[in-house]
């Protein structure tokens, strides 16, 4: 293969791969017809002048996961055909000016996971055809004005995982073709008005895991093509009323892990394409009517781990397409009978870890497609007659860790549970809390005759048209099916990250097997 170095493997497709700790310099001679060269996991510490001079047909060059800390300015001379250059996962602290000069065809430049302390306008001034620039995982504290001014064709820019404390409002002004901008995991505390105004084609903006406290009202007003906006794990305490007003294409918005106390009216909208809204781990205390009413296509709404104690009966107006609603780990004590009335397509609802003492009999009356209901760890003593009767698709119902009162009023529920045991899961079954003589016994197998008879006036049945006779269950059996819904947690799926750690701690994401978030 035109002379393949012994430390490398060369394929017929003009691909050369050189790996191994014994390699301390760029191997020679490299095949003159090589189009792809990978130098990985070596002990190379520096690149001297023109080590690739004789392979001018090279299109892709990956020099990754080495000990590389120094590069001579002329290292990439004569690589005019090079389209892809990766220097990721090395130990570079400084880039020499002019390093990329002559790389007129370069489209992708990966400098991620090094130790770069600064970049200058002169570094990329020759890279006019660059489409992708990866700078994440360095030690950049500041991006000077003009740094990207010549990169007018850039479509993807990753500055995540640096030490940026502020961004100049002019630094992105010439990047009219940019589609993806990632600034996650920095130390940004605020973003000046106008910073994103030039990014008219932006589709993804990742600002999660910073220290942003305040969003300027018009920060995203020019980003009409934005589809994914990640604002999670910041210090945002309030959202200006018009901040999301001009985002008609948005389909994913993450705001979890902030300090939001309330959701201003009309804050979400109009966003006709929004499919997912992640709001867990905030300080929201109540949900007024119509707060989500502009989100007609929303399918996933995650409100878990807040402090919600009141939900207005019209809070979920407009959410006719919602599939997943997570309200677990809040401070809910009461739910108005109409609160879920609009959620005709709801499949999974999580209400565990609240303080619910009772449920309205018609709480699920319009929600015929429910497949999973999480009600564990509340203050429920009984459930209204017939509450699950119409839920033919229900296959997962969690009722454990409630103080069930096993007097004669529990019979209809007990009988229904007997017939529908598979839906309760095998991990934990509901047990009686009172009377004392049956405490701790399974609600399903309890002999109610030994329990104290009911001394309180029973509630009016929710479905009075369904007669109940003590010797027959009020809750008819329905076919038990297993839940197939599996939502993934909101991991921002970046193809340019070498590793993505997915936490499968369901308590973090908030649902059970059928639901994440």
């Amino acid at each position: 293969y035109h002379g393949c170095p012994s430390e490398c493997t060369c394929s017929r497709a003009s691909q050369v791969e050189c790996t191994g700790a014994r390699i301390v310099a760029v191997p020679t001679p490299l095949p003159w017809n090589a189009m792809s060269l990978q130098i990985l996991n070596t002990h190379i510490t520096e690149l001297n002048e023109s080590p690739f001079l004789n392979i001018s047909a090279l299109i892709a060059l990956r020099i990754e996961k080495n000990e590389l800390s120094r590069i001579t300015p002329g290292a990439f001379r004569n690589l005019g055909s090079l389209r892809y250059l990766s220097l990721a996962n090395n130990k570079l602290q400084v880039l020499p000016i002019g390093l990329f000069q002559g790389l007129d065809s370069l489209e992708s430049l990966l400098l991620s996971s090094n130790q770069l302390l600064q970049i200058q306008p002169a570094h990329f001034s020759q890279c006019s055809n660059l489409k992708e620039l990866q700078l994440h995982g360095n030690h950049l504290e500041y991006i000077p004005d003009g740094a990207f001014d010549h990169l007018v064709g850039l479509t993807k820019l990753n500055l995540g995982k640096n030490s940026l404390t502020h961004i100049s409002p002019r630094v992105f002004q010439h990047l009219g073709n940019l589609q993806v901008l990632r600034l996650y995991e920095n130390r940004l505390t605020d973003i000046p008005m106008g910073t994103f105004d030039g990014l008219v084609n932006l589709q993804e903006l990742a600002l999660q895991q910073n220290q942003i406290g305040l969003l300027s009202p018009g920060l995203f007003h020019n980003n009409h093509n934005l589809q994914r906006l990640y604002l999670s794990n910041n210090h945002i305490s309030q959202l200006p009323p018009s901040v999301f007003m001009q985002l008609p294409q948005l389909n994913r918005l993450t705001l979890f892990g902030n300090s939001l106390k309330e959701l201003s009216p009309g804050i979400f909208g109009p966003m006709p394409n929004l499919r997912e809204l992640w709001l867990y781990d905030n300080h929201i205390s109540s949900l007024p009517d119509n707060v989500f009413s502009n989100l007609r296509q929303l399918q996933v709404l995650i409100l878990s781990r807040n402090q919600i104690s009141f939900i207005s009966p019209g809070a979920f107006n407009g959410l006719t397409e919602l599939r997943e609603l997570s309200l677990h780990t809040n401070a809910l004590q009461d739910l108005d009978g109409n609160v879920f009335r609009m959620l005709a397509n709801l499949q999974n609802i999580s209400l565990q870890n609240n303080r619910l003492r009772q449920l309205p009999g018609n709480i699920f009356a319009n929600v015929n497609g429910l497949m999973a209901i999480q009600l564990q760890n509340n203050q429920l003593e009984n459930l209204p007659l017939g509450i699950f009767d119409h839920l033919g698709k229900l296959c997962e119902l969690r009722l454990y860790d409630n103080p069930w009162r096993c007097d004669s009023d529990i019979l209809p529920l007990r009988n229904w549970l007997l017939l529908n045991q598979p839906r309760l899961g095998t991990d934990t079954v509901p047990v009686c809390f009172s009377p004392a003589n049956v405490r701790g016994q399974s609600l399903i197998i309890i002999n109610v005759n030994v329990a104290v008879p009911s001394v309180h006036v029973p509630e009016v049945p929710s479905y009075p048209e369904t007669p109940w006779y003590p010797d027959t269950p009020s809750y008819p059996d329905t076919t038990s099916v297993s839940s197939t819904t599996e939502l993934t947690s909101p991991v921002e799926d970046y193809t340019d990250l070498t590793t993505i750690q997915v936490t499968d701690d369901r308590s973090v994401w908030g649902m059970t097997q059928a639901q994440s978030g």
Epitope: P241, D289, S293, P313, R357
Partner: antibody, heavy 118, light 107 residues
Framework: QVQLVQSGAEVKKPGASVKVSCKAS????????INWVRQAPGQGLEWMGW????????KYNEKFKGRVTMTVDTSTSTVYMELSSLRSEDTAVYYC???????????WGQGTLVTVSS | DIQMTQSPSSLSASVGDRVTITCKAS??????VAWYQQKPGKAPKLLIY???YRSSGVPSRFSGSGSGTDFTLTISSLQPEDFATYYC?????????FGGGTKVEIK
């Protein structure tokens, strides 16, 4: 159909208390919030607070906190609003009202006139 | 508390007239505004909710509009039974508050 029937008119002296009742019918009483709204003669409407009959939980307008108490008797499907330390400016018609599909008042009681006079 | 400023406080009109009543909230309440009609000695009656939705049984001559802070109730062609007092109410945040009322009288 939903009906809210209130107790009759009351005349009270300043400093006294009054307890107005509101009996609900035509729906499952424990499942929906009931509010109290008052209207002084020739004046506008003023929201006093709500009670959730299923649990007895309440939320009061700060203006009335410490003076108003809302309670429930599920056995008779009745909610009560007690206002203490009455003053002449508490003279008003007191309405109970139930929300519909939102936090607006779809169903109203007929009102109870409370007159505070020495 | 959110103030709801209603205007005019009273107006005189004739049967068949188009009547417009406005309500201004002291802060953004989204579309969480309702309009009520009240006749002497009677409880208020819900006309409009969510700023623009007619309650069931309410004639189509009644319409509502607005969002944020500015809201309007319009009676397109005043009928004899429409002479009453009209109130707006915000239900976006506690305490829920009402406007001062607009009395519509016969000219």
């Amino acid at each position: 159909q939903v009906q809210l029937v209130q107790s009759g008119a009351e005349v009270k002296k300043p400093g006294a208390s009054v307890k107005v009742s509101c009996k609900a019918s035509g729906y499952t009483f424990t499942d929906y919030y009931i509010n109290w709204v008052r209207q002084a003669p020739g004046q506008g409407l003023e929201w006093m607070g709500w009670i959730y009959p299923g649990s007895g939980n309440t939320k009061y307008n700060e203006k009335f906190k410490g003076r108003v108490t809302m309670t429930v008797d599920t056995s008779t499907s009745t909610v009560y609003m007690e206002l203490s330390s009455l003053r002449s400016e508490d003279t008003a018609v007191y309405y109970c009202a139930r929300w519909g599909y939102g936090a607006y008042f779809t169903y109203w009681g007929q009102g109870t006139l409370v007159t505070v006079s020495s | 508390d959110i103030q709801m400023t209603q205007s005019p406080s009273s107006l005189s009109a004739s049967v068949g007239d188009r009547v417009t009543i406005t309500c201004k909230a002291s802060q953004n309440v989204g579309i969480n505004v309702a309009w009520y009609q009240q006749k002497p000695g009677k409880a208020p009656k819900l006309l409009i909710y969510s700023a623009s939705y007619r309650s069931s049984g309410v004639p189509s001559r009644f319409s509502g509009s607005g969002s944020g802070t500015d809201f309007t109730l319009t009676i397109s062609s005043l009928q004899p039974e429409d002479f009453a007092t009209y109130y707006c109410q915000q239900y976006n945040s506690f305490p829920y508050t009402f406007g001062g009322g607009t009395k519509v009288e016969i000219k």
